[in-house]
């Protein structure tokens, strides 16, 4: 008995393969600065990079600004949104701004979207400073099903900071659903 | 045939060991209050605790304020930075403050550094309040290679809150690179 | 030798089972709007949902607002706290508000509690705006032992936003302790 029996060899590899988990889904998506909507109303951000700079995606799909889940699981979701304004860009849309982010889940099973996370602040940017800046970060752990889509809505999209380190969102799968 | 053949025993344990993943790299580093730079300019924070209170590190290395990656992988990085000022400490550096954090990646191979994440806010702390406080949180999922280093830069370091629950950064490996 | 020897069968399954990690502990707890304390002092939030909407819990226990760890491990902890005020609700508790969150660890063995994370901001909400809003997010990686409990303290609880996407905290186990 000098080796692994033929019958067992497959199982061996199977178990070993199972021991090394397959690559889990993830995404880190950065804002596409060339395609930020104007205005001060609340909008869905529909243009994100997935393959340049820090942006990356695996076992998830990006389409029309929505991050689509391909694999059931528990995911950690996060978003970082930066707003900025320099007086050289003209005046801000209003003295009192609501700078907000909503991380939203949509699905063919649900006719409206559902806010998973929100964050933000009201700001008075009418002051004497020539530059204004504000960032929001949200994160949370959610059960997501294949076919569900995650998107990001913001108020005052014209004030978004277009840098890849400033405005991004992402997800990574932490574990399976039982 | 009453036991596991000697030849197989190693493989058995190997597979079993592989089944139980080895401890993944992580770090949670808290600010060293004794060594916070003064001034209002942007600086790299070069002194962090790694082994007292909540601070800890495993399979990563801390050197001169930089958190060095020893193992390729996808990591979740985060930072929490608190700024505070009490009127008993004298006046703030300026009426309009930019309270900012930058989480930065550098590599021995490439001398330049790259901002992975940023956050913050402009603040007017010249008001009638005797105490001012503001916190920033950022987090994101990044591919890091062995030898790359993560550091934290802030503006107005003299305003940093030195508590371990206030000013910290960290990382934990989520998964391997393919 | 046409199959797996009886003696080995258990080991086979064991290894295979070990290959598929058991469900790790996690919780995502959302504020119970019906039970938010009044006042402007600092309080522990003692009423959270664990089983409706986005709220969920597994292999952890919620009791009297405290999230109890049942399994030693390294956990990522997070909290998102939103404060808001509309002028129709009357005036704010003070011109200058400290809007703060503290994520706290207590242990049955040690009666004292320890702040793991804090965040927040001082705010002047006495301005001309009819609506005010502000959110805080904190997160970090901590070693937790079975029997330890995590809770959330906030200042100005009467200003909390009661939406499930606004005010929540959570945890998920990332890895074992060696």
């Amino acid at each position: 008995f000098s080796g692994v029996p033929a019958m067992m060899e497959g199982s061996w590899l199977d178990v070993a393969r199972r021991g090394k988990p397959e690559a889990q889904p993830f995404a880190h998506l950065t804002i596409n600065a060339a395609d930020i909507p104007s205005g001060s109303h609340k909008v869905s951000l529909s243009s994100w990079y997935h393959d340049r700079g820090w942006a990356k995606i695996s076992n998830m799909t990006l389409s029309n600004g929505k991050l689509r889940v391909n694999q059931d699981g528990f995911y950690y979701l996060y978003a970082n949104i930066c707003f900025r304004h320099h007086e050289t860009s003209g005046s801000v849309p209003a003295d009192y701004l609501q700078l907000m982010v909503y991380v939203v889940k949509t699905s063919i099973k649900i006719p409206s979207s559902h806010n998973l996370m929100k964050g933000g602040s009201t700001k008075n940017w009418s002051g004497n400073s020539e530059f204004h800046f504000y960032s929001i970060n949200v994160g949370g752990f959610f059960k997501l099903r294949a076919g569900e889509e995650i998107s990001v809505q913001v108020s005052n999209p014209s004030l978004l900071d277009p840098d890849q380190d400033a405005t991004y969102f992402g997800a990574f799968k932490v574990q399976d659903i039982d | 045939f009453s036991g596991v053949p000697a030849m197989m025993e190693g493989s058995w344990l190997d597979v079993a060991r592989r089944g139980k993943p080895e401890a993944q790299p992580f770090a949670h580093l808290t600010i060293n209050a004794a060594d916070i730079p003064s001034g209002s300019h942007k600086v790299s924070l070069s002194s962090w605790y790694h082994d007292r209170g909540w601070a800890k590190i495993s399979n990563m290395t801390l050197s001169n304020g930089k958190l060095r990656v020893n193992q390729d992988g996808f990591y979740y990085l985060y930072a929490n930075i608190c700024f505070r000022h009490h009127e008993t400490s004298g006046s703030v550096p300026a009426d309009y403050l930019q309270l900012m954090v930058y989480v930065v990646k550098t590599s021995i191979k490439i001398p330049s550094s790259h901002n992975l994440m940023k956050g913050g806010s402009t603040k007017n702390w010249s008001g009638n309040s005797e105490f001012h406080f503001y916190s920033i949180n950022v987090g994101g999922f990044f591919k890091l290679r062995a030898g790359e280093e993560i550091s934290v830069q802030v503006s107005n370091p003299s305003l940093l809150d030195p508590d371990q629950d206030a000013t910290y950064f960290g990382a934990f490996k989520v998964q391997d690179i393919d | 030798f046409s199959g797996v020897p009886a003696m080995m069968e258990g080991s086979w399954l064991d290894v295979a089972r070990r290959g598929k990690p058991e469900a790790q502990p996690f919780a995502h707890l959302t504020i119970n709007a019906a039970d938010i304390p009044s006042g402007s002092h600092k309080v522990s939030l003692s009423s959270w949902y664990h089983d409706r909407g986005w709220a969920k819990i597994s292999n952890m226990t919620l009791s009297n607002g405290k999230l109890r760890v049942n399994q030693d491990g390294f956990y990522y902890l997070y909290a998102n706290i939103c404060f808001r005020h509309h002028e129709t609700s009357g005036s704010v508790p003070a011109d200058y508000l400290q809007l703060m969150v503290y994520v706290v660890k207590t242990s049955i063995k040690i009666p004292s509690s320890h702040n793991l994370m804090k965040g927040g901001s001082t705010k002047n909400w006495s301005g001309n705006s009819e609506f005010h809003f502000y959110s805080i997010n904190v997160g970090g990686f901590f070693k937790l032992r079975a029997g330890e409990e995590i809770s959330v303290q906030v200042s100005n609880p009467s200003l909390l936003d009661p939406d499930q996407d606004a005010t929540y905290f959570g945890a998920f186990k990332v890895q074992d302790i060696d």
């Epitope: 609340k42 909008v43 869905s44 529909s46 689509r68 063919i108 099973k109 006719p111 076919g147 | - | -």
Partner: antibody, heavy 121, light 107 residues
Framework: QVQLVQSGAEVKKPGSSVKVSCKAS????????IEWVRQAPGQGLEWMGV????????NYNEKFKGRVTITADKSTSTAYMELSSLRSEDTAVYYC??????????????WGQGTTVTVSS | DIQMTQSPSSLSASVGDRVTITCKAS??????VAWYQQKPGKAPKLLIY???YRYSGVPSRFSGSGSGTDFTLTISSLQPEDFATYYC?????????FGGGTKVEIK
């Protein structure tokens, strides 16, 4: 401008099938869901089903399950609704409508002009 | 399924009148309610979304209110072109459901 144009009126025999088309223009077809709603003569509005044209995901009203099939052709920006085993009570005007998910209001706008389907022996 | 009960089913009014139509949901639907106007032989047109937001191009005389289970569409001063049938619709959950309609006729 944003428009949904439906195929023309149909007269069908009981037991047969009908396939109504809805051609979208003026917007990115895959960005928005297409819902199908019908209205029997002198009656109210009844939802039949929905498709995500980007992926082909569908969701149907239980009442029509097994009889209705909604599809989409991205290349022509056209959605289709097929209803089989027709009976006289299926006589109605069939509408397609776009569900706006981009602005966070999820109501139906615009609607197609409607396709009258008459089921008669 | 969520029932949307609309009342009245019809009403007669004159130009300049203030008209109120109500809709009651059988369960909490938040503010996920829309109102549509439909004229004979035409497709419905969106007037109000999210219970109280007027759709672009809709005259300011149309307003919506309510949340949870009780919703109202108000026409502050009825105009000749407003004689039509009005439907409420919930989009809290599938299947989408509509009220039975309110026909606004000339007195």
């Amino acid at each position: 401008q944003v428009q949904l144009v439906q195929s023309g009126a149909e007269v069908k025999k009981p037991g047969s099938s009908v396939k109504v088309s809805c051609k979208a223009s003026g917007y990115a077809f895959t960005n928005y869901y297409i819902e199908w709603v019908r209205q029997a003569p002198g009656q109210g509005l009844e939802w039949m089903g929905v498709i995500n044209p980007g992926w082909g995901d569908t969701n149907y009203n239980e009442k029509f399950k097994g009889r209705v099939t909604i599809t989409a052709d991205k290349s022509t920006s056209t959605a289709y609704m097929e209803l089989s085993s027709l009976r006289s009570e299926d006589t109605a005007v069939y509408y397609c409508a776009r569900r706006d998910t981009a602005h966070g209001y999820y109501a139906l706008d615009p609607w197609g002009q409607g396709t009258t389907v008459t089921v008669s022996s | 399924d969520i029932q949307m009960t609309q009342s009245p089913s019809s009403l007669s009014a004159s130009v300049g009148d203030r008209v109120t139509i109500t809709c009651k949901a059988s369960q909490n639907v938040g503010t996920n309610v829309a109102w549509y106007q439909q004229k004979p032989g035409k497709a419905p047109k969106l007037l109000i979304y999210s219970a109280s937001y007027r759709y672009s191009g809709v005259p300011s005389r149309f307003s919506g209110s309510g949340s949870g289970t009780d919703f109202t569409l108000t026409i502050s001063s009825l105009q000749p072109e407003d004689f039509a049938t009005y439907y409420c619709q919930q989009y809290w959950d599938y299947p989408l459901t509509f009220g039975g309609g309110t026909k606004v006729e000339i007195k």
